[in-house]
Interface confidence: medium
């Protein structure tokens, strides 16, 4: 079965006007000597093994939090988009446990 | 059911060491980031800690940034924070919770499930 | 650092009526992507926070429809329609916009 890795929205730094990046400052483990991290970009799973994931939506990683979700088409909802709603959902169940 | 429980907590010397843990389980738990917020004795709820579903990445603020240490075994479900150079400032309750996100059309940002905290007291 | 400023302290009400809490930040909480990473909690007494509002207005699972969330920019508010013995406890707005991510002092709902 599929492993979905959610996705949180990265907040944004109060000197973002100064700061280009919307991530947080944050601390990678592994440093220069994690076996040439620095210069090995991650692979966007989007592209591979989520590729087909979202039925109604677009595949969506965020690399700061190595988390993957699917941003739904306006009428649907769920965790892979796979669900119509009838009119605006206010409250959704977020218990995805497997 | 999502359930998150803290153990590890205790009376420490200040400049000691203490190293939390939290039990999760009830949700796929190496699918969510996860965070560490304490709660001073005067009721105010402080963010101290979060850390991506990998582990990769860890975010601190400065009050505990060098000091503290926010990992994670996937492997058995278990969020840690081992704490080092306490202060008194560092006393409160500490909660391990789950960063949660509930899709519709995009994302947000909170703690969804709280666990039900473990007491760290830093005195001499 | 964005502060959470809630007025009152304390907030005494009966049974049956509306209770409306307010939270003002700092510093305005629109995210660059539209958005406002302000939410809610409710702390009762022993227990641990819980989630009731997610980005100003969207009840939580579980959440009963007599909560509300409104308000934009820096300034929010709580509303309570009917008050129930079980939504006594201390209520805490929170953002999550920027970093570090911050939380008000809390308002404490108790019986008039």
């Known amino acids: 079965s599929v492993r979905v890795e959610q996705v949180v929205k990265p907040p944004q730094n109060k000197t973002e006007s100064e700061n280009t990046s919307d991530k947080p400052k944050r601390k990678k483990k592994g440093g220069k000597n994690g076996k040439n991290r620095r210069n090995r970009k991650k692979k966007n799973p989007c592209n591979a093994e989520f590729q087909n994931f979202c039925i109604h939506g677009e595949c969506k990683y965020i690399e700061h939090l190595e988390a993957v979700t699917c941003k739904c088409q306006q009428e649907y909802f769920g965790e892979r988009c796979g669900e119509k709603s009838m009119k605006t959902h206010s409250m959704i169940d977020s218990s995805l446990s497997k | 059911e999502v359930k998150l429980v803290e153990s590890g907590g205790g009376l420490v010397k200040p400049g000691g060491s203490l190293k939390l843990s939290c039990a999760a389980s009830?949700?796929?738990?190496?699918?969510?980031?996860m965070s560490w917020v304490r709660q001073t004795p005067e009721k105010r709820l402080e963010w101290v800690a979060t850390?991506?579903?990998?582990?990769?990445?860890?975010y601190y603020p400065d009050s505990v940034k060098g000091r503290f240490t926010i990992s994670r075994d996937n492997a058995k479900n278990t969020l840690y924070l081992q704490m080092s150079s306490l202060r008194s400032e560092d006393t409160a309750m500490y909660y391990c919770?789950?960063?949660?996100?509930?899709?519709?059309?995009?994302?947000?940002?909170?703690?969804?499930?709280w666990g039900q905290g473990t007491s760290v007291t830093v005195s001499s | 650092d964005i502060v959470m400023t809630q007025p009152p302290l304390s907030l005494p009400v009966s049974l049956g009526d509306q209770a409306s809490i307010s939270c003002r930040s700092s510093?305005?909480?629109?995210?660059?992507?539209?958005?406002?990473?302000l939410h809610w909690y409710l702390q009762r007494p022993g227990q641990s926070p819980k989630l009731l509002i997610y980005?100003?207005?969207n009840r939580f699972s579980g959440v009963p429809d007599r909560f509300s969330g409104s308000g934009s920019g820096t300034d929010f508010t709580l509303k309570i329609s009917r008050v129930e013995a079980e939504d006594l406890g201390v209520y805490f707005c929170?953002?999550?916009?920027?970093?570090?991510?911050?939380f008000g002092g809390g308002t404490k709902l108790e019986i008039k």
């Open positions: 919770a789950r960063q949660g996100p509930i899709y519709y059309g995009n994302y947000y940002y909170a703690m969804d499930y």
């Open positions: 009830g949700f796929t738990f190496s699918s969510y980031p």
């Open positions: 850390i991506s579903t990998g582990g990769t990445y860890t």
């Open positions: 510093q305005s909480l629109v995210h660059s992507d539209g958005n406002t990473y």
């Open positions: 980005k100003v207005s």
């Open positions: 929170s953002q999550s916009t920027h970093v570090p991510y911050t």
